[in-house]
Amino acid sequence: VSPTFQVVNSIAPVQECSTQLDIVIVLDGSNSIYPWDSVTAFLNDLLERMDIGPKQTQVGIVQYGENVTHEFNLNKYSSTEEVLVAAKKIVQRGGRQTMTALGIDTARKEAFTEARGARRGVKKVMVIVTDGESHDNHRLKKVIQDCEDENIQRFSIAILGSYNRGNLSTEKFVEEIKSIASEPTEKHFFNVSDELALVTIVKTLGERIFALEA
């Protein structure tokens, strides 16, 4: 070894998603999601790992409960910084109904259109975050099949908070949210004990999303 050789400490950067993906996050905004800022903290931690731009990853957000709102489209923002600012400002829309099938179907039919910024030939990813059984679960099977037919990769997250608060069985709920996730389920489905724990899955979720373009 040369006498001039030096050991230099270096820090590996946080893994970033610098690939081309169109990601639509579908958020349950019904009243039972509490506290809401746990959701915005989760969004912040997930989005700051992404390299967002018109030629990189694009992110859109849809919020649903009794009805559906497009918080912002895939092509609305052209940098990670802009998306982070917008995501922080998303307010909970409320409502007692959890129309999960409607939320997913609206994301598929509307959020993933070219008019809203979806790009031809770019992999579509949907992340669904919810805390309760859907009130329109009779539609869920068909809606998921429609996503499958359009090659939309789905990650689903079950928040068990409202079930734990009411000491209710989570079995039926977990099965429903598992059915939303793409195969293999164990790589596309997550569950957290409550809203505060959402941030604990960000790293793994991020890595699995990024792996889609590996």
């Epitope: 506290p35 909970q92 409320g94 409502g95 409202s162 409550d194």
Partner: antibody, heavy 124, light 108 residues
């Protein structure tokens, strides 16, 4: 901007009936629970009950069950608190407040993030 | 129902001083579902803190909440003239809402 605007002060005699109101704006009023809170002169805050204007589902504090009626008219984004027969001990400031949280099934939780300006009710 | 006891009843301090307000519950408050409100004379209460330690929108960072189980604290790191008011704690983990009796922070 989220706002809860309450009706004006009332002076009533014992035995009379009364209905006070709380009109919400700046958010989807039918999608959030509205609570009512009493504050007697020089005293602290007491939760009375809560209503979901979307379907008028109502919960009462045991202390106020049967003493008051909480209702809502979702078409005009308004919640109401009413008495059929007022007593001198009903003299107080009454506040409405929006619940950030839920009260579905048997479980209620959440904090009150926006409050009305209060309605002073005097019974004498 | 859960009874909340606030102490002291009155706190006499000067602007710039640190205020520490206590709220003790008669039984454990689930998920740290405890909030703090500020009320000034002839005004409605204003939300300061929820889930024991989260600041509400627009609340200055001199206000902080801590605690879990049965013991909770609201701290005002450096009192400003506008902070002299009555402070209430409130629990909401038992399908009803109960408030403490209040702590008055007055100018010394």
């Amino acid at each position: 901007e989220v706002q809860l605007v309450q009706s004006g002060a009332e002076v009533k005699k014992p035995g009379e009936s009364l209905r006070i109101s709380c009109k919400g704006s700046g958010y989807s009023v039918t999608s959030y629970w509205i609570g009512w809170v009493r504050q007697m002169p020089g005293k602290g805050l007491e939760w009375m009950g809560i209503i979901y204007p979307g379907d008028s589902d109502t919960r009462y504090s045991p202390s106020f069950q049967g003493q008051v009626t909480i209702s809502a008219d979702k078409s005009i984004s308004t919640a109401y608190l009413q008495w059929s027969s007022l007593k001198a001990s009903d003299t107080a400031m009454y506040y409405c407040a929006r619940l950030q949280g839920d009260c579905s099934g048997g479980t209620c939780y959440g904090h009150f993030d926006y409050w009305g300006q209060g309605t002073l009710v005097t019974v004498s | 129902e859960i009874v909340l006891t606030q102490s002291p009843g009155t706190l006499s301090l000067s602007p710039g001083e640190r205020a520490t307000l206590s709220c003790r519950a008669s039984q454990s408050v689930s998920s740290s579902y405890l909030a703090w409100y500020q009320q000034k004379p002839a005004q409605a209460p204003r939300l300061l803190i929820y889930v024991a330690s989260r600041r509400a929108t627009g609340i200055p960072d001199r206000f902080s909440g801590s605690g879990s189980g049965t013991d909770f604290t609201l701290t005002i790191s450096r009192l400003e003239p506008e902070d002299f008011a009555v402070y209430y704690c409130q629990q909401y983990g038992t399908s009803s809402w109960t408030f403490g009796q209040g702590t008055t922070v007055e100018i010394k």
